[in-house]
Amino acid sequence: EEELQVIQPEKSVSVAAGDSATLNCTVSSLIPVGPIQWFRGAGPGRELIYNLKEGHFPRVTPVSDPTKRNNMDFSIRISNITPADAGTYYCVKFRKGSPDVELKSGAGTELSVRAKPSAPVVSGPAVRATAEHTVSFTCESHGFSPRDITLKWFKNGNELSDVQTNVDPAGKSVSYSIRSTARVVLTRRDVHSQVICEVAHVTLQGDPLRGTANLSEAIRVPPFLEVTQQSMRADNQVNVTCQVTKFYPQRLQLTWLENGNVSRTEMASALPENKDGTYNWTSWLLVNVSAHRDDVKLTCQVEHDGQPAVNKSFSVKVSAHPKEQGSNTAAENTGTNERNIY
């Protein structure tokens, strides 16, 4: 009598997540009488996948009718495959008895599940930083299989090199995640810059998945301040200008102080954007020189994006002022300045 063979013809089967997997199994003989069962894994911890006689296996269906007479095909189809279904599946023949006795197992079919990575999500720093500082961006993608994946970072199309990437877990798993951190040195020109995280995987039809972040969310460009005085008007009024240039974001409050007392406070709004994404703003203050007996200390105080205020100050000498002024005069452009205009 020829010994019964349990034939699993495929050593391995690959399937895409969401598809169905067919696991083939035939037996060479109808005897001895007894059921066929499918298991995932071997040994005492194996998991029952399908048993015709009992149990509820909603995702598993027999390929051919197992109740038909002389049936020797015990192939099964598992629907809606997920990465968690990966493993080695064994078709096992039992001899009928009380209880049934395991007689012979097939060689096993390894089911590998290919799953696409999720769209990469890029997150930037929690607080803004200024030019010359380094900020970190993180990119994450999950749920892919097999483990092999490539991740690249780009800033304005140029690949970044200061990158640290990890794929988890390190060992064998049903699916994997990737997390990468890129360190970017900011420049004043980065308001319109963009970082891109690009993920390539065997399941993607040639084009990598991309996640993006705008450096505008991460950068603060502090303003330059310049205070100038226009020509003296006939009515003894001096027009003083505070030019606030090249700042980002737009959130800015400007306060004029005369001899330390608040004269006027303004909030920047609806400013036109410069080509590089920064903003400029000009504020004017009319000072009636004849109303003052002593020199007037004028201060333009700018508070940008919640940062400590920056001041520009200068003094207007009230006595012996000429009626006409030939040229504009500017306060110096750094720190807190006092400058005699006359």
């Epitope: 092999d148 065997v202 039809q205």
Partner: antibody
Framework: VQLVESGGRLVQPGTPLTLSCTVS????????MGWFRQAPGKGLEYIGI?????SPYYASWVNGRFTISKTSTTMDLKMNSLRSEDTATYFC?????????????WGPGTLVTVSS | DIVMTQTPSSVEAAVGGTVTIKCQAG??????LAWYQQKPGQRPKLLIY???TLESGVPSRFKGSGSGTDYTLTISDLESADAATYYC???????????FGGGTEVVVK
């Protein structure tokens, strides 16, 4: 699902030539497609692929001599300044549904002969 | 580019016999290896992908194995219809490029 190459013929060295691969039964916007060639009596050689969105990638030896492009139903291989060593049967192929690491559907090929 | 070294270049075996073809990659290709069969004047036909997964409709007499850099195609119970040239093809997931082995001609006596 079918692929058919066309455009192969006898040309003189230095002549440009464009081959086409016409597909049916699936959408070119869903799969990576590739071009390969096989010189008489020799093995298979990879030329390049075009991604589902239309981005081409080439073997390092191509050096800008060949250009791959596509429309909704055809993929083209534009060959500049052909040489005698470009004489080969040119195949187009589609990657498998599970990934880009293998090609499961191939066209019958079209013969390009470069000779004076 | 990855170089694929396929051996032997030619092999002869009798009907019912077994043939083993080896393919070695210049660096690890993480099981991204396919095997094709090509008969004279015909297009290549996919047999196996991902090192060991049998393409639908291909007889189970064709078996692929291997990992890392070394891969094997075994054809058992040889039939006269198996006479053909067999090619291995790699895909490298980092460079995303393809390479073929030089081919093995199988002659069935």
């Amino acid at each position: 699902v079918q692929l058919v190459e066309s455009g192969g013929r006898l040309v003189q060295p230095g002549t440009p030539l464009t081959l086409s691969c016409t597909v049916s039964g699936f959408s070119l916007s869903s799969y990576v497609m590739g071009w390969f060639r096989q010189a008489p009596g020799k093995g298979l050689e990879y030329i390049g692929i075009i991604s589902s969105s239309g981005s081409p990638y080439y073997a390092s030896w191509v050096n800008g001599r060949f250009t791959i492009s596509k429309t909704s139903t055809t993929m083209d291989l534009k060959m500049n300044s052909l040489r005698s060593e470009d004489t080969a049967t040119y195949f187009c192929a589609r990657v498998g549904p599970l990934g880009v690491d293998y090609f499961n559907i191939w066209g019958p090929g079209t013969l390009v002969t470069v000779s004076s | 580019d990855i170089v694929m070294t396929q051996t032997p270049s030619s092999v002869e075996a009798a009907v019912g016999g077994t043939v083993t073809i080896k393919c070695q990659a210049g660096q690890s290709i993480n099981s991204y290896l396919a095997w094709y069969q090509q008969k004279p004047g015909q297009r290549p036909k996919l047999l196996i992908y991902y090192a060991s997964t049998l393409e639908s409709g291909v007889p189970s007499r064709f078996k692929g194995s291997g990992s890392g850099t070394d891969y094997t195609l075994t054809i058992s119970d040889l039939e006269s219809a198996d006479a053909a040239t067999y090619y291995c093809q790699s895909w490298h997931y980092i460079s995303r490029s393809y390479a073929f082995g030089g081919g093995t001609e199988v002659v069935v006596k």
